[in-house]
C-alpha cells in the first residue's frame, strides 16, 4: 500500500490479556509485538478495536483455549467476532466452534477467524467466547487485528 | 494495490517440503502453485522467508498435521509462527496448540495462524513445531505466505 | 488501498446456504453481513467467486462443521480451496483436514484455509467438502472471501 | 515463583568435557531467551553464551566459541550447555538467566549457579 498522507496505511494486532471481569468479551492489550499503526485504528477499554475512517477491512482473531469434556457444559466452546457500528445493535460477524477435548486436565485447542468487512467511521469489532476462563494467554495463542484494504 | 516501481507488491506463498533433518523448523519450497512476487521477498534455506523492505505485512501460516494420544508425549502440538530480526533472538509471533486425537493410527487436524506485524529489511520469519514427523505434505495442507500491505 | 477508478478495491465475502444438491461443492450466498466491492467480482451460480482482473489475491474459507466419529466414513473431513481457470482442470490451493469428533450427536470443529495466490482473468475459486450435509450454517460459521492485493 | 536451578558442576581436567543442565519453573519457559553467565573468582560477570525461544538462534562469546554448545529442551524446561575442550580460564561459577539480549549479561531472572573448576 505505503500509501501517503491521503491514505495512510491502517492496521492493528493486539494480545491477549488475562481478566478478572466474567464479562464474555476478550480483553487485549498493546504489549509484546503489537501493531498500531496510528490513530485511525485504536484499542477502546481493551476490547474493542475502533476505527475513524469508512471503508474494507479484513479483521481476523485467533483464540487458543483449554477445556475439557467432563468439566465444561455440553455446549461447545465457540468464538464470535462482533461488529458494533454506532446507533445500532452488535451483530455476529464471524464464529468458530470447537468441541471440549477428553484430554484431562484440559485439551488445548486454536481457533483462527478472519473475513473482508466494510465498517463504517466509529464501528468497532470485539470478540466473544462462551468461557473467557479457559482461553489461553500465553505469548502468541491469543491475539486479534485488522488491516485496511 | 497494484502498485508502480516505487511501490511494488510484495507477496509470497511457500508449499510444505518433507525433511530428513530433524529440526523442528519446517521447510518449504517454491513448487506447485506457490507465489513469490519479484526478489523483494525470498525464500532462504529452504525454511524462512526474508523481507528487504520495512513495512507492515500480514503473514500467515497453515499445519496440517496426524497424530495420536497414546503414541506422542502428553503435550500438545504447537505451532509457532516466528521473528527473527538481524542480531537479536527469535520471538515467537504467534503460536496455535491442538491436543492430539484419539483416532489410530492418527487423528488429522489443522492449525491456521495470521496476524499483521512491523517487519525490519532483513527480517525473516520462519514456522516451528512439536512434531515434525506428524506434519501432513499432501497437496495444499501445509503452507506459509506473506503479503505486504 | 483507497484506489482511484483504474485501481478499484476489489473484495468479497459470502455467506454459506444450505442447499439441497448433493454436490461436495459448498453453496453461497449475498445475504447477511456479506462483501461484493464491484462487478469486478461475482458470485456465480452461487458455488464460485470469478474474478475479472488478473492479479495476487488472498483467499480464504472458513467452515465449521458437525460430525461424529461413529456415524462418519473413517476418513476425516477435508475441506478444500480450488482453482479454475478458463481452459484448464480445477486444481486444489489449500486443504484442511479435521478427524471427527466422538462426541455425540456431533461435535463441531472449525477449519480456517487462507493463502495468497495469482489469479488470471475469468479464474474462478470454490470451495468442496467431503460431507456437505455436516456443514453448519448458523450466522457466521461458515465463510467464503477474497481480497486483490 | 522462578526457580532456576543449575546442575553438572565438579572438577574436570584441562581437555575434558562437562555437561551443565537448569531447570525451570514457575514461568513460561518456552517463551523466553535463555542464556548462560559466569563469574571466575575475584571477578566480575561474563556472558558466555544465550539461545533463543525455540532454540533457532544461538550466540556465543569469543572466549567459549567452538567449544560450547548451548541448548534447550522446551518439553522439559530445561536449559544445557555442553562444554568441551575445557581450559583453566573457564573456572568460574555459572548461572544461568533468561536473556534480555543477545550479547550481555542483562537478565531479571537468574539462579544459585554451579560452580565449574578445570584443573589438573
Known amino acids: 500500500m505505503q500509501k501517503g498522507d491521503q491514505n495512510p496505511q491502517i492496521a492493528a494486532h493486539v494480545i491477549s490479556e488475562a481478566s478478572s471481569k466474567t464479562t464474555s468479551v476478550l480483553q487485549w492489550a498493546e504489549k509484546g509485538y503489537y501493531t498500531m499503526s496510528n490513530n485511525l485504528v485504536t484499542l477502546e477499554n481493551g476490547k474493542q478495536l475502533t476505527v475513524k475512517r469508512q471503508g474494507l477491512y479484513y479483521i481476523y482473531a485467533q483464540v487458543t483455549f483449554c477445556s475439557n469434556r467432563e468439566a465444561s457444559s455440553q455446549a461447545p466452546f465457540i468464538a464470535s467476532l462482533c461488529l458494533k457500528s454506532p446507533g445500532r445493535f452488535e451483530r455476529i460477524l464471524l464464529r468458530a466452534a470447537n468441541t471440549h477435548s477428553s484430554a484431562k486436565p484440559c485439551g488445548q485447542q486454536s481457533i483462527h477467524l478472519g473475513g473482508v468487512f466494510e465498517l463504517q467511521p466509529g464501528a468497532s469489532v470485539f470478540v466473544n467466547v462462551t468461557d473467557p476462563s479457559q482461553v489461553s494467554h500465553g505469548t502468541g495463542f491469543t491475539s486479534f487485528g485488522l488491516l485496511k484494504l | 494495490m497494484q502498485k508502480g516501481d516505487q511501490n511494488p507488491q510484495i507477496a509470497a506463498h511457500v508449499i510444505s517440503e518433507a525433511s530428513s533433518k530433524t529440526t523442528s523448523v519446517l521447510q518449504w519450497a517454491e513448487k506447485g502453485y506457490y507465489t513469490m512476487s519479484n526478489n523483494l521477498v525470498t525464500l532462504e534455506n529452504g525454511k524462512q522467508l526474508t523481507v528487504k523492505r520495512q513495512g507492515l505485512y500480514y503473514i500467515y501460516a497453515q499445519v496440517t498435521f496426524c497424530s495420536n494420544r497414546e503414541a506422542s508425549s502428553q503435550a500438545p502440538f504447537i505451532a509457532s509462527l516466528c521473528l527473527k530480526s538481524p542480531g537479536r533472538f527469535e520471538r515467537i509471533l504467534l503460536r496455535a496448540a491442538n491436543t492430539h486425537s484419539s483416532a489410530k493410527p492418527c487423528g488429522q487436524q489443522s492449525i491456521h495462524l495470521g496476524g499483521v506485524f512491523e517487519l525490519q529489511p532483513g527480517a525473516s520469519v520462519f514456522v516451528n513445531v512439536t512434531d515434525p514427523s506428524q506434519v501432513s505434505h499432501g497437496t495444499g495442507f501445509t503452507s506459509f505466505g506473506l503479503l505486504k500491505l | 488501498m483507497q484506489k482511484g477508478d483504474q485501481n478499484p478495491q476489489i473484495a468479497a465475502h459470502v455467506i454459506s446456504e444450505a442447499s439441497s444438491k448433493t454436490t461436495s461443492v459448498l453453496q453461497w450466498a449475498e445475504k447477511g453481513y456479506y462483501t461484493m466491492s464491484n462487478n469486478l467480482v461475482t458470485l456465480e451460480n452461487g458455488k464460485q467467486l470469478t474474478v475479472k482482473r488478473q492479479g495476487l489475491y488472498y483467499i480464504y474459507a472458513q467452515v465449521t462443521f458437525c460430525s461424529n466419529r461413529e456415524a462418519s466414513s473413517q476418513a476425516p473431513f477435508i475441506a478444500s480451496l480450488c482453482l479454475k481457470s478458463p481452459g484448464r482442470f480445477e486444481r486444489i490451493l489449500l486443504r484442511a483436514a479435521n478427524t471427527h469428533s466422538s462426541a455425540k450427536p456431533c461435535g463441531q470443529q472449525s477449519i480456517h484455509l487462507g493463502g495468497v495466490f495469482e489469479l488470471q482473468p475469468g479464474a474462478s475459486v470454490f470451495v468442496n467438502v467431503t460431507d456437505p450435509s455436516q456443514v453448519s450454517h448458523g450466522t457466521g460459521f461458515t465463510s467464503f472471501g477474497l481480497l486483490k492485493l | 515463583e522462578v526457580q532456576l536451578l543449575e546442575s553438572g558442576g565438579g572438577l574436570v581436567q584441562p581437555g575434558g568435557s562437562l555437561r551443565l543442565s537448569c531447570a525451570a519453573s514457575g514461568f513460561t519457559f518456552a517463551s523466553y531467551p535463555m542464556g548462560w553467565v559466569r563469574q571466575a573468582p575475584g571477578k566480575g560477570l561474563e556472558w558466555v553464551s544465550s539461545i533463543g525461544p525455540i532454540g533457532f538462534t544461538t550466540y556465543y562469546a569469543d572466549s567459549v566459541k567452538g567449544r560450547f554448545t548451548i541448548s534447550r529442551d522446551n518439553s522439559k524446561n530445561t536449559l544445557y550447555l555442553q562444554m568441551n575442550s575445557l581450559r583453566a580460564e573457564d573456572t568460574a561459577v555459572y548461572y544461568c538467566?533468561?536473556?534480555?539480549?543477545?550479547?550481555?549479561?542483562?537478565?531479571?531472572?537468574w539462579g544459585q549457579g554451579t560452580l565449574v573448576t578445570v584443573s589438573s
Open positions: 538467566a533468561e536473556m534480555k539480549s543477545p550479547y550481555k549479561p542483562q537478565f531479571d531472572y
